[in-house]
Structures are given as C-alpha cells and as structure tokens.
C-alpha cells in the first residue's frame, strides 16, 4: 500500500524554539516515521533537518539548527515505513517574520504600598532577537487577588514600579513583551502573585519638586514627621531601558545626604545635560522609609524654567507689567523654546491678601489698584505642555508705589 504524505504542517517559532507539528495522513498505518528536509533560498539541494529525522510522533524540534533567522527557508516532509511517501512541501517562510516573542521572565519585590517588577526576556541571549534586544517594551495586567478587577499598564521597560497599592494585599500580574519596530506582540508570562508588606512605620517622602535658583537646583519634598534625616539619590533615566541591567546603581547627591530639612540645594554642575530620576528616603535613626516615588528630572527643561524677569510701569490705578526672558549668569537672556504661561501674584504691602493673574501674554495689566499705595508683585512661569508640567520658582518680589489719582491715562 502506498504511504500518503503527511498533511497540515505547522511551524511554531517562539523565541529560539522551532517546533514542527503535522497530521498523519493515514491513522490506520502503524510504525510510521517522519523525516524533514530543508532548503535555503538560492540553493537547489535539500539538506536533512537535524532533530527531525525518523520521528515516530507528530512533533519535532529543530532549535539546534543554526539558521540565519532573516533568510527564507523551505521545508518538506515525508512518511516512511518499508517504503516512503512522496514529499509534502511546506510554504517557505522567514523565521524572524514567523517568530513570536515568548513569555518574559518576571521577578517581583514587595514594599508596603508598592511592587517592583523586574522583567527580562524569556530566552537569554536569544538569536532571534539579537538585533532587537534593546527595543523590547512590555505591558502588564495587574489585579488585586481578592477582586479580579484588571488594570492595564502599557509601554514599560525592564524595571517598573507600581505605587499607591494597599498594604498586606495580594496582587497578581502577567507581563508580555512587544517589539513595536516589528509589529510583534508576545505571549503573556505565567501569572505571578505577591503580597505587599505590613504598612511601614515611616511613610516615604512625597511631592518632590525641583526648581532652579541662581546656579543651584533646589529639591523640595513633603514629609509627615519632624526630626528626620533624608537622603536623595539619582539615576540616569536611560538605564531603566537597559534589559540586561538588573543592578540600578543609584548615586548619592553629596549635598543631599543626611539632610535634616525637607529640601536640599546643590550646584547645577552636579548634573550634565540629560534626563535623570530622583528619589528621596527618610530615616529617624531607627527606622528607614521605603524610597519615594521616582521623579523624572530633565536638566534642559529645568534650566530653561527660570523665574521670569519683569519691569513695572506704575499708574494711579494699575500696574503695567512687561515680562522678559530670565537672565543667566553673565546677563545673557535664556532662550525660551517652550510656550509659557505666567502666574502673577500681587498684594498691598501692608496686607497679606494676595491676588492672582494667569496670563499667556508678556505684557500684563494689573487693574483696580489704589493711588499712592505700595504694591508688591512676584511672578513665575509654567510650561503649557501637560507632559512636562513644570513650574519655575517665583521671582523675587518687586514693590512699587502707584501714582497719585490723576495719572490713570
């Protein structure tokens, strides 16, 4: 009896694992084996596919074959007993195009109100993704074990921290990788669960803000308790994207080590141009808080957001304020590359009652003032871009007296 060729051959490639599956054509014939050949583009001869010769099952693995994953290959299969079937040719394919990204490896660390997720590719030193290793991004689905309500987080890198969680609560998550450059979305990892710890005695510092004063950066934060010491650390933001890096070498800011106030001042030259992450930790001598949420700090934006410089022309019932570019040292104006909005605060010198004006224009009228009265004015700039959402510190207050009653024109 003639053996029939196997049918319905499927090629599954996940990372560097190459699996072939097929259907027997004739279930009634026993003791049949199957063998594959392969052919590279531009070659006439067929080569035996190692790992897929004389196979008794309907599945084989040819991962050991060292292929150029960007080169098209063709496969053929036949059945063998005493005689052999005709060859069945599988549609040619390029391994890289066919490959799926496997489930990533996930490692979790717990704090009281946060979880740190470390993600790495499921296959170490993968041949398939050798040129794309730095391009992986990840997405995850997280839920409270008790509720099952899922939250999706997209476009994260090899280390991600999720904040604002509840203490002593089990959270579960699964992660998948993507190569957006190749339009590839991977397979989810198994579900990983971790319980957040009991609430820490000391909360982390909050509301960290960076501003510029003179040639210094001023870092401020809020803290619940008094008599604490704080330390501040920084990290190059790009290091978060490096998939091979599991040790994040956070560095101390020397002027911000063991400070006893909720702010510290350090020279601008501590940081070269770039984007950094900053974090703050509190200690009372016995206990230490977890680290604060990490804030992104862009020296370009920060340096540019100096408080505005302004001139006041005084009338009897109003001030005309003319806002100019802030001056750097050496009295050169700072180039403003971003659209700004200005917040102007003014008050009567003898009163604490402040009034506020928000303006996009650089010439602003402050109306409804009393004649022959001293008013003080300070201003700050805000970026209009929501993503940056930066504010300068307030300028120093400038105080001027309004003119007598007949000079309103």
């Amino acid at each position: 009896k003639n053996l029939k060729s196997p049918q319905k051959v499927e090629v599954d490639i996940i990372d560097d694992n190459f699996i072939l599956r097929w259907n027997r054509s004739d279930e009634s014939v026993g003791n049949v084996t199957f063998s594959f050949d392969y052919q590279k583009t531009g070659m006439d001869n067929w080569i035996k596919l190692s790992g897929c010769q004389n196979i008794t099952s309907t599945k084989c693995n040819f991962s050991s074959l060292k292929l150029n994953v960007y080169e098209e290959i063709k496969l053929r299969i036949r059945a063998e007993k005493e005689n052999t079937s005709s060859w069945y040719e599988v549609d040619s394919f390029t391994p890289f195009r066919k490959a799926q990204i496997g489930p990533p490896e996930v490692h979790l660390e717990a704090e009281d109100k946060a979880i740190v997720i470390h993600i790495s590719p499921g296959t170490k030193d993968s041949v398939m993704w050798a040129l794309d290793g730095l391009s992986f991004t990840y997405s995850l689905v997280i839920w409270k074990n008790s509720s099952g309500v899922e939250e999706r987080i997209e476009n994260i890198y090899s280390r991600h921290k999720i904040y604002k969680l509840s203490p002593e609560t089990t959270y579960c998550l699964k992660v998948k990788a993507a190569l957006l450059t190749s339009w590839k979305i991977g397979v989810y990892s198994p579900v990983h669960c971790i319980k957040t710890t009991v609430e820490n005695e000391l909360p982390p510092p909050e509301n960290i803000e960076v501003s510029v004063q003179n040639q210094n950066y001023v870092l401020k934060w809020d803290y619940t308790y008094a008599n604490m010491t704080f330390q501040v650390q920084w990290l190059h933001a790009f290091l978060k994207r490096n998939p091979g890096n599991h040790l994040y070498k956070w560095k101390q800011i020397p002027d911000c080590e063991n400070v006893k106030t909720t702010q510290c001042v350090f020279p601008q030259n501590v940081f070269q141009k770039g984007i950094y992450l900053l974090r703050v930790q509190a200690s009372d001598g016995n206990n230490t808080s977890f680290w604060s949420e990490e804030i992104k700090f862009d020296t370009e934006i920060q340096a540019f957001l100096l408080p505005p410089v302004f001139n006041i022309r005084s009338l009897s019932d109003s001030f005309h304020i003319y806002i100019g570019a802030p001056k750097q040292s050496g009295n050169t104006p700072v180039i403003q590359d971003y659209p700004l909005i200005y917040e102007i605060i003014f008050w009567e010198n003898t009163s604490n009652a402040e009034r506020k004006i928000i303006e996009k224009k650089t010439d602003v009228t402050v109306p409804n003032l009393k004649p022959l009265t001293v008013y003080c004015v300070k201003a700050r700039a805000h970026t209009m871009d929501e993503k940056l959402n930066k504010s300068s510190v307030f300028s120093d207050a400038v105080c001027e007296k309004t003119k007598p009653g007949n000079t309103s024109k």
């Epitope: 490692h107 660390e109 717990a110 470390h118 009991v198 040790l247 994040y248 070498k249 560095k251």
Partner: antibody
Framework: QVQLVQSGAEVKKPGASVKLSCKGS????????IHWVKQAPGQGLEWIGR????????KYAPKFQGRATITADTSISTAYLELSRLRSDDTVVYYC???????????WGQGTLVTVSS | DIQMTQSPSSLSASVGDRVTITCKTS??????VAWFQQKPGKAPKSLIY???YRYSGVPSRFSGSGSGTDFTLTISSLQPEDFATYYC?????????FGPGTKVDIK
C-alpha cells in the same frame, strides 16, 4: 563561569596593615558591586562594606569606617580590602561577594584567613 | 542599623525531616532578604534571594517565604548534604546585616 578568587592567607603583627584582593572572572566587574564580609572563628557573618568598581563609590559599616578601605582596579577585574591598625580580634576569614541588584550576593570568593599575632 | 534575629539558634533533625528556620528584622525590609548555607571551613553558598527566589542549581526542597519583618527558610525533606549553618541577610538599607545563624545538625 563566574568566579571570585581571593588572595592567600596572611600573618600580620598588631598595628600593621593588610591588603587582600578578590579577582573576578566570567563577568564584567564594572556591572556589579563587590562586597566584603568578615567571619571570626566559630562566629557569624559581618558586613564590612562594598564598592562600585565603575566609579569607586564605597559604603562602609560604621564599625569599619576609617579602618577599612575598599578599592578596585577594573583593568584587572580586582577589588581590594585594606585593613589598618590590625588587632588580635581581626584574626578572621574575609570573604568577597558579588552583588547583583535584586539577586543580592550571588557569588562568593573562597575566603582569606588573616592571622594577627605578635 | 537593622537588627536580625534567627530562631532556633540550632536544631537537630533527621534525614527526610521538614525543617523551618525563621528570621526577624527590626524594621520592615520589604522582600530584600537572602538566605545562605555555610559548611565548616567553606565560603557561604547563596540559596535564596528576594525572600523566595531560588538561585539556579539550588534544589527545590529549599524554599523561602515572608515579607516585611518575618521571613522563613524551609527545607521540605532534609538531605545528608544539608547539615550546615544557615544565615539570613537583609539588603534593604546600609549597613547590610546578617542573622546570627542557625546550625542544623544530625539528630
């Protein structure tokens, strides 16, 4: 494979100094921290300090601050521990270990016995 | 400094026994705890990191659990080669510290 090989045993007089080495192979020392730990005979482990070989930043346990100095030479993948003003209770085994982020201290050297005796 | 206590300080057990060693820290250290095994005259061997993750090559009979201030190392079925001293270690904040050790010997 990853290995940390420490220098041989040392015998020193009280008040002297000793410099121990720890050579890493099978990994780039700049990508890790190297830690030093001491162990007195029959006692537990005690952390001395660590170095980031990439920029020579160090941290020390308060007890060893000023008496221990950790350095590194990345060109030969080696970290060093120098102990000054040796006392008889410094007769201990010193271990170096590789620290790898959340993987903590994953590999250890074989240890160096320092004997301080007059 | 973060203090670490271990209990028991020593225990006698037989091959096949389930052994549990506990470690307490003086403050919340999240999951930044590792466990080491040490045999006389040898360097410590790393068993567990981040509270519950086994290093590659460590047998599955070793497991770790806990978080915050209370941590446990469990050996599900004690083998002859497991008789040693076990140390816990916190790497949450400097100075890093170790527990005093738990000696596991043959009953």
């Amino acid at each position: 494979q990853v290995q940390l090989v420490q220098s041989g045993a040392e015998v020193k007089k009280p008040g002297a100094s000793v410099k121990l080495s720890c050579k890493g192979s099978g990994f780039n020392i700049k990508d890790y921290y190297i830690h030093w730990v001491k162990q007195a005979p029959g006692q537990g482990l005690e952390w001395i300090g660590r170095i980031d070989p990439e920029d020579a930043e160090t941290k020390y346990a308060p007890k060893f601050q000023g008496r221990a100095t950790i350095t590194a030479d990345t060109s030969i993948s080696t970290a060093y521990l120098e102990l000054s003003r040796l006392r008889s209770d410094d007769t201990v085994v010193y271990y170096c270990g590789r620290y790898h982020g959340y993987w903590a201290l994953d590999y250890w050297g074989q240890g160096t016995l320092v004997t301080v005796s007059s | 400094d973060i203090q670490m206590t271990q209990s028991p300080s020593s225990l006698s057990a037989s091959v096949g026994d389930r052994v549990t060693i506990t470690c307490k820290t003086s403050q919340n250290v999240g999951t930044n705890v590792a466990w080491f095994q040490q045999k006389p005259g040898k360097a410590p061997k790393s068993l567990i990191y981040s509270t519950s993750y086994r290093y590659s090559g460590v047998p599955s009979r070793f497991s770790g659990s806990g978080s915050g201030t209370d941590f446990t190392l469990t050996i599900s079925s004690l083998q002859p080669e497991d008789f040693a001293t076990y140390y816990c270690h916190q790497y949450f904040s400097y100075p890093y510290t170790f527990g005093p050790g738990t000696k596991v010997d043959i009953k």
